[in-house]
Amino acid sequence: MMTGTIETTGNISAKKGGSVILQCHLSSTMAQVTQVNWEQHDHSLLAIRNAELGWHIYPAFKDRVAPGPGLGLTLQSLTMNDTGEYFCTYHTYPDGTYRGRIFLEVLESSVAEHSARFQIP
């Protein structure tokens, strides 16, 4: 029985050229996390964090994606093309799979404020 919930940074915005932290948090469960996958809007894999073997950043994103903090992911040197959905998938036992969604909007405006708050999608 899956009792946990995924909390995410929800809908966030950040400046073009800047950086942003994508964060998911699994709560309300004692399940053990074996692997966390991070995917972007076209469902291509950005990175995985395996509980035993650590972080693996997909080579194409190595210059712009940094692991952490925690099980989160930091996107750097943002472009307008980075706008869209991002997904964290928590593979756990004995519960199974949990999935969270974040929407990132990259703004041209110099007045764009990085806004992030934890919320349950």
């Epitope: 053990q32 074996t34 692997q35 996958n37 995917e39 894999l45 995985i48 395996n50 509980a51 035993e52 073997l53 650590g54 972080w55 693996h56 997909y58 998938t89 593979h91 756990t92 036992y93 004995p94 519960d95 199974g96």
Partner: antibody, heavy 125, light 106 residues
Framework: QVQLVQSGAEVKKPGASVKVSCKAS????????IGWVRQAPGQGLEWMGW????????NYAQKLQGRVTMTTDTSTSTAYMELRSLRSDDTAVYYC??????????????????WGQGTMVTVSS | DIQMTQSPSSLSASVGDRVTITCRAS??????LNWYQQKPGKAPKLLIY???SLQSGVPSRFSGSGSGTDFTLTISSLQPEDFATYYC????????FGGGTKVEIK
């Protein structure tokens, strides 16, 4: 084709060390983990640990901690397993095996689909 | 560590028989279970991963089922080349194998 070729049989004295190699070919070496499993004569399979060929991180079976070291050489697509302070009960066939899932498949890492032919290590005085 | 108990440890069967091997985990492992076949003097071969997914190139007479703590490998119609030892392996850290089931000719 995808294959793992291991080094030849070894005979060692108690207290010595052994280093077994496992050369990969036919796939992108850095996209898959490599695990090591051993099998004592007439016995079952025993998990030893594994290594990420991408970042070099390792995870070892607790009973072997401190005696085993797994490494990779990405320039030659070769994985190595060194076992130190050998005892008679380390006598076994040692297998390397490729993780069935690429790091980039999104699948949870865990099964092993391609295996080396095995390396017999005999520990005897 | 999670213990994996396979049963039976050995069985005798004839060509054409339906064979079932079970594997029980000491605690729930979701679907983190794989099955291997090993013939004497050879390396293990992956048959089933994630409890029920058939590995590419493996005949469809092999199937896997179960989740949580109880898992089954079924060979629907035993063939001469299927006489071997079968191992389950759980892939929850730290990985462990079952003790094996030897399938012999009756």
């Amino acid at each position: 084709q995808v294959q793992l070729v291991q080094s030849g049989a070894e005979v060692k004295k108690p207290g010595a060390s052994v280093k077994v190699s496992c050369k990969a070919s036919g796939y992108t070496f850095t996209s898959y983990p490599i695990g090591w499993v051993r099998q004592a004569p007439g016995q079952g399979l025993e998990w030893m640990g594994w290594i990420s060929s991408y970042n070099g991180n390792t995870n070892y079976a607790q009973k072997l901690q401190g005696r085993v070291t797994m490494t990779t050489d990405t320039s030659t697509s070769t994985a190595y397993m060194e076992l130190r302070s050998l005892r008679s009960d380390d006598t076994a066939v040692y297998y390397c095996a490729r993780g069935a899932s690429s790091f980039w498949s999104g699948d949870v890492l865990g099964a092993f689909d391609i295996w080396g032919q095995g390396t017999m290590v005999t520990v005897s005085s | 560590d999670i213990q994996m108990t396979q049963s039976p440890s050995s069985l005798s069967a004839s060509v054409g028989d339906r064979v079932t091997i079970t594997c029980r985990a000491s605690q729930s492992i979701s679907s983190y279970l794989n099955w291997y076949q090993q013939k004497p003097g050879k390396a293990p071969k992956l048959l089933i991963y994630a409890a029920s997914s058939l590995q590419s190139g493996v005949p469809s007479r092999f199937s896997g089922s179960g989740s949580g703590t109880d898992f089954t490998l079924t060979i629907s119609s035993l063939q001469p080349e299927d006489f071997a030892t079968y191992y389950c392996q759980q892939s929850v850290p730290p990985r462990t194998f079952g003790g094996g089931t030897k399938v012999e000719i009756k």
